[in-house]
Interface confidence: low
């Protein structure tokens, strides 16, 4: 079943998706698509990363997080009612049928009032384990669920909105560390 996320018309929607690179520089291709995850790849691709970079994206769709550390959460700018629906985050782990697939449901609500331009909303999660991903940037704490038997750890967050992105950053940078792998 899909995890549901909400945003209002005119705001930015945020669909969280994370993985942990097995080693520095060991990035894994990721695709985001509109519609539930198919057997292979993503349908109606809106954004794609490869082993080094974001190599494809379409208007209004972008990664605000630090994708080099595995934060491949999707931001959709200035959403409309037409943006409602299922989105697929697919972590394309090498090997046959190894991909991690996550379906996230986006529900767009009509704006109560005409929205002033706002910053992106951030979300945080509540899982029982913590991981600090490693790169050469500041530590970013991400909350994790159960870990699969592979060197890549994937989560999608179950979250309430944090209205102030600074708060989300403070939570991410709070420094709890468990080394995995």
């Amino acid at each position: 079943s899909e995890v549901e996320y909400r945003a209002e018309v005119g705001q930015n929607a945020y669909l969280p998706c994370f993985y942990t690179p097995a080693a520095p520089g060991n990035l894994v291709p990721v695709c985001w698509g509109k519609g539930a995850c198919p057997v292979f790849e993503c349908g109606n691709v809106v954004l794609r990363t490869d082993e080094r970079d974001v190599n494809y994206w379409t208007s209004r769709y972008w990664l605000n997080g630090d994708f080099r550390k595995g934060d491949v959460s999707l931001t959709i700018e200035n959403v409309t009612l037409a943006d409602s629906g299922i989105y697929c985050c697919r972590i394309q782990i090498p090997g046959i049928m190894n991909d991690e697939k996550f379906n996230l449901k986006l529900v767009i609500k009509p704006a109560k009032v005409t929205p002033a331009p706002t910053r992106q909303r951030d979300f945080t999660a509540a899982f029982p384990r913590m991981l600090t991903t490693r790169g050469h940037g500041p530590a970013e704490t991400q909350t994790l669920g159960s870990l699969p038997d592979i060197n890549l750890t994937q989560i999608s967050t179950l979250a309430n909105e944090l209205r102030d992105s600074r708060l989300a950053n403070d939570l991410r940078d709070s420094g709890a560390t468990i080394r995995i792998g």
Partner: antibody, heavy 117, light 108 residues
Framework: QVQLQESGPGLVKPSETLSLTCTVS????????WNWIRQPPGKGLEWIGY???????NYNPSLKSRVTISVDTSKNQFSLKLSSVTAADTAVYYC???????????WGQGTTVTVSS | EIVLTQSPGTLSLSPGERATLSCRAS???????LAWYQQKPGQAPRLLIY???SRATGIPDRFSGSGSGTDFTLTISRLEPEDFAVYYC?????????FGGGTKVEIK
Amino acid sequence: QVQLQESGPGLVKPSETLSLTCTVSGGSISRHYWNWIRQPPGKGLEWIGYIHYSGSTNYNPSLKSRVTISVDTSKNQFSLKLSSVTAADTAVYYCARDTGYYGMDIWGQGTTVTVSS
Amino acid sequence: EIVLTQSPGTLSLSPGERATLSCRASQSVSSSYLAWYQQKPGQAPRLLIYGASSRATGIPDRFSGSGSGTDFTLTISRLEPEDFAVYYCQQYGSSPLTFGGGTKVEIK
């Protein structure tokens, strides 16, 4: 093709703040890591810091207390501010793009900043 | 902080000769995050090698990189006149990002 261009005053007085801007053309700043590096006359390269397009920053600890790097995605620019400068901060200052796995693949041509009264 | 030590400081060679430049790290560097740059007088550095051994776009195949852990090497198989310059290694896998002190390859 992406190009980087540094701009800013070539002369700064001691104790003042050095301010430089790097303009990204031919591509979007809303990807990658954007670095500042400097090179004192006749010496090697020193990394100052970077800003990720999302706004997160990382600075060289030796300069951290004096450095601020910011990004203006609407202008496709990122900036360096270095406070309380001394003659030791005289250098050629470069901006460079760091794509992550590929390293710093695109550099500006550099701008010389002299700290002198 | 990872300290990168390059040797020799200066390498005096003739065109057509083979150049071998060394970069030694004070602690292990992920080979995914080790780069080599070339810098000519009055110019910005130019990326030659990333990931310790992969040539950047447009770099001639006479340039090659190798090594892992703490010892890395840049080899120029046959020096061309335009190859005489200063070469820097850099690690970008841990903070702070650091450069080696450079090796100057000069005409003998």
